[in-house]
Structure formats: structure tokens, C-alpha cells
């Protein structure tokens, strides 16, 4: 009774395309696979940026996987064959490991790379990023931004660079066609005259780092002798009503009365004959229908109802 | 307006320490990314101490362990701490702050030098 063995996969690479992170993990059919030919094989497919302590697993037929990694740090995998129980008689055979690594080799020393990278989504429409300049570079180096999405044939660089100093400090990009809900993979690159610079990678999802436009065109509407309903409209933009969280703050005679944050339109307050004053504003995000994260608007312009009897109807300004 | 002015410099003999300090108004300094530059004759200002909004720092190798930066948020003033001062460290230090995405305002400078 003869044990079964199969090998593992051949020529198993890691092969970078020009994408920013975005990678491609092939390999080819294992040696000697021809008593298996009524077998389908399956491979087992394991990888992960070095320095993490989770793998990614797969078990896929085809002889390719891609996914996004981060090139900041290398990369690690290894696959092996598996033949099913049907193949075997009964139990299933896996081949020995093959494995593979690839990393981008760095230039210059780590702190050369910039600082505090930001990118902000205005509106889900305009999206811009900026940067410091990291540590131990002159006023002559200057930066360098690609970004690559699903969607384009090949990574592209800035085309209109926020200068400050004479450097590249931001990138204000152009219209994103179907750009969201995708890995968006960025890289800044630096070159100096005295020092290599090291590159930055960064990879996020548009929609969840949108800053929307302020509310606008708040008003009161007296609702009954002891409640007034507060009503806003969402700004212009592409962002649907069913997207929006709000946060309101509601001052009363100069007295913060209420910070409340609501799913809709509209906030009805509970007040008093006495009120002199009132008056409130309120702010914008994404909400977790829509994105996984989001950052708030700045707030609205502040309405006011001030010196007439609050008793009245309808109060608009 | 925005206003940076450091202070602090001066003639020091090497092995010993300067304090500078760099007073800022006209923006939210909580807020700004704030660095320290050097220029020493004939060469490019050079970035060698930053720190970010929330006090991370980054030093560059050359004063990795004799300087360091930090900031007093409720005064305005960012601080570069230098110690065991060496000829090479003679520059103008200048102070520099980003507030924002596409702000950078600088001090006027001020003179370090170092005698053997």
C-alpha cells in the first residue's frame, strides 16, 4: 500500500505591477500531477505583511491571487497543494510548503519619508492630500505623488502639487471616476540632491474619510405651545440624505441647552414660554449605512430667533 | 497675522547646552505641526526636529539623543532643548510651523555657534 505524495506548486512568485501595494501571487501546477488527472487539485495560499501575526488564508483552484499589502513593509507567503479526499481514498494530501518573500528595497533612512500624510474626501467629490517633509532633508528635496486605483491601466502621478517653500507639501486631485468603496493606494517619493529619500505608502477607501459640506437653510417651526422643530437641509453634492449623521447644538438665553446628534432632518425641542432666545447650529458626516469612518463638517452658519414672542407660528430667517 | 520669533541662541563651547524657544501667535498652535530648521553658512536649511499636533517627534541622526524638541500648548511656544553641543551643530535655527494643508510660516532665525 503505497503512500501518496503530491509536490508543491512550481515557480511560486510574488510579481509587482506598478500598482502602490496592489500584488500578484502566481505560481504553476505541481510536478508529476499524472495520476491525479481526475483529480481537480486545490491549493492552500498563506501570506501577510511581514510583522503581522495574522496570515490571510485562501484555498482557491486557480494558479493566481491578487490583494493589496503594505509596501512600507515586505511581504511573506507560502502555498502548497492539496489534494482532496476524493483523490486519496479517503484522507487529504498536502504537499510540503513553497514560499516566497518580496520587498521593495528602501531608499535612504527611515525619517527621510513624510510626515503627517493626510488625505481628506471634501463632499465625496474633490479629494485632497497633503504632507509634511520628513526629517534631515533640505529645502531642495522635493516629493512625488502616485496613486493607483482598480479601475486604471497603471499608477498615476499628481498633476497639481500644493507648494509651500518652493516643496511639494499636498496634491489636489482630479475627478475620481469610481474611486470608492476600492482600495485607493498612494505613494509619496522624495529626491534630494545630498540624500536618497524614502518612500511612503499609504492604501484607504474615499469613503471613509469624507468631509461633507456644512447643513444649510435652518429653520424653527412651532409645533405646539411647548415645542419648536428645528429643520436643516443637506448641502449640494452627491451625497444622499440616507448617508448623513447630524450633531446639533442648541443654545437657549445664552446657555447651552443641548448637543444631540440625530439620523434626519429635523430635532424637535422641548422649550419653555420664557425662552427670549434661541438658537442653534449644526454639523454633517458620513454615517455607518454608508462608510466605516468619516470626519465631520464644520459647523453651519448659526440661525437665531432673538426678541419676539417664540409663541408665534412659523419662525423663519 | 502669523508670527514666529525664536529665541535662546548664542556662543556656547562645545559640550554645552542652549535652550531655544519660539513664541508663536496669529494661528491655533495646538493644532500645527511645528519643526525645527537649521542653516549653516553656505549650505540649505536642513529639517532636523519636528513635532506633530498630538507631541510625536522625529529627530534626525546627526542630534538623535543631545537635542529635543517639545511644546507648551497653553503658551504658544515651541522649545528645542540642545545639549552636548558640538562645532558642527553652528547655524541660524529657525522655527517653522504648518497649521494647516498649505501654510508654512518661519521665525526670523536665530544664531547657535559653537567654539571649540
Known amino acids: 500500500d503505497t503512500e501518496i505524495k503530491v509536490n508543491p506548486p512550481q515557480d511560486f512568485e510574488i510579481v509587482d505591477p506598478g500598482y502602490l501595494g496592489y500584488l500578484y501571487l502566481q505560481w504553476q501546477p505541481p510536478l508529476s500531477l499524472d495520476h491525479f488527472k481526475e483529480c481537480t487539485v486545490e491549493y492552500e495560499l498563506k501570506y501577510r505583511n511581514i510583522g503581522s501575526e495574522t496570515w490571510k488564508t485562501i484555498i482557491t483552484k486557480n494558479l493566481h491571487y491578487k490583494d493589496g499589502f503594505d509596501l512600507n513593509k515586505g511581504i511573506e507567503a507560502k502555498i502548497h497543494t492539496l489534494l482532496p479526499w476524493q483523490c486519496t481514498n479517503g484522507s487529504e494530501v498536502q504537499s510540503s510548503w513553497a514560499e516566497t518573500t518580496y520587498w521593495i528595497s528602501p531608499q535612504g533612512i527611515p525619517e527621510t519619508k513624510v510626515q503627517d500624510m493626510d488625505c481628506v474626501y471634501y463632499n465625496w467629490q474633490y479629494l485632497l492630500c497633503s504632507w509634511k517633509p520628513g526629517i534631515g532633508v533640505l529645502l531642495d528635496t522635493n516629493y512625488n505623488l502616485f496613486y493607483w486605483y482598480e479601475g486604471l491601466d497603471h499608477a498615476l502621478q499628481c498633476v497639481d502639487y500644493i507648494k509651500a517653500d518652493g516643496q511639494n507639501i499636498g496634491c489636489r486631485f482630479p475627478y475620481l471616476e469610481a474611486s470608492d468603496y476600492k482600495d485607493f493606494y498612494i505613494c509619496v517619493n522624495g529626491s534630494s540632491e545630498n540624500k536618497p529619500i524614502r518612500s511612503s505608502y499609504f492604501t484607504f477607501q474615499l469613503q471613509n474619510i469624507v468631509k461633507p459640506l456644512p447643513p444649510v437653510y435652518l429653520t424653527f417651526t412651532r409645533e405646539s405651545s411647548c415645542e419648536i422643530k428645528l429643520k436643516w437641509s443637506i448641502p449640494l453634492g452627491p451625497i444622499p440624505a440616507r448617508c448623513f449623521d447630524y450633531e446639533i447644538e442648541i443654545r437657549e438665553d445664552d446657555t447651552t441647552l443641548v448637543t444631540a446628534t440625530v439620523e434626519n432632518e429635523t430635532y424637535t425641542l422641548k422649550t419653555t414660554n420664557e425662552t427670549r432666545q434661541l438658537c442653534f447650529v449644526v454639523r454633517s458626516k458620513v454615517n455607518i449605512y454608508c462608510s466605516d469612518d468619516g470626519i465631520w463638517s464644520e459647523w453651519s452658519d448659526k440661525q437665531c430667533w432673538e426678541g419676539e414672542d417664540l409663541s408665534k407660528k412659523t419662525l423663519l430667517r | 497675522q502669523v508670527q514666529l520669533k525664536e529665541s535662546g541662541g548664542g556662543l556656547v563651547q562645545a559640550g554645552g547646552s542652549l535652550r531655544l524657544s519660539c513664541v508663536a501667535s496669529?494661528?491655533?498652535?495646538?493644532?500645527?505641526?511645528m519643526g525645527w530648521y537649521r542653516q549653516a553658512a553656505g549650505k540649505q536649511r536642513e529639517l532636523f526636529a519636528s513635532?506633530?499636533?498630538?507631541?510625536?517627534?522625529v529627530y534626525a541622526g546627526s542630534v538623535k539623543g543631545r537635542f529635543s524638541i517639545s511644546k507648551n500648548n497653553a503658551e504658544n511656544t515651541l522649545y528645542l532643548q540642545m545639549d552636548a553641543l558640538r562645532p558642527e551643530d553652528t547655524a541660524v535655527y529657525y522655527c517653522?510651523?504648518?497649521?494647516?494643508?498649505?501654510?508654512?510660516?518661519w521665525g526670523q532665525g536665530t544664531q547657535v555657534t559653537v567654539s571649540t
Open positions: 496669529g494661528f491655533t498652535f495646538s493644532s500645527a505641526w
Open positions: 517653522n510651523a504648518r497649521p494647516g494643508a498649505v501654510n508654512s510660516y
Open positions: 513635532i506633530t499636533s498630538s507631541g510625536d517627534t
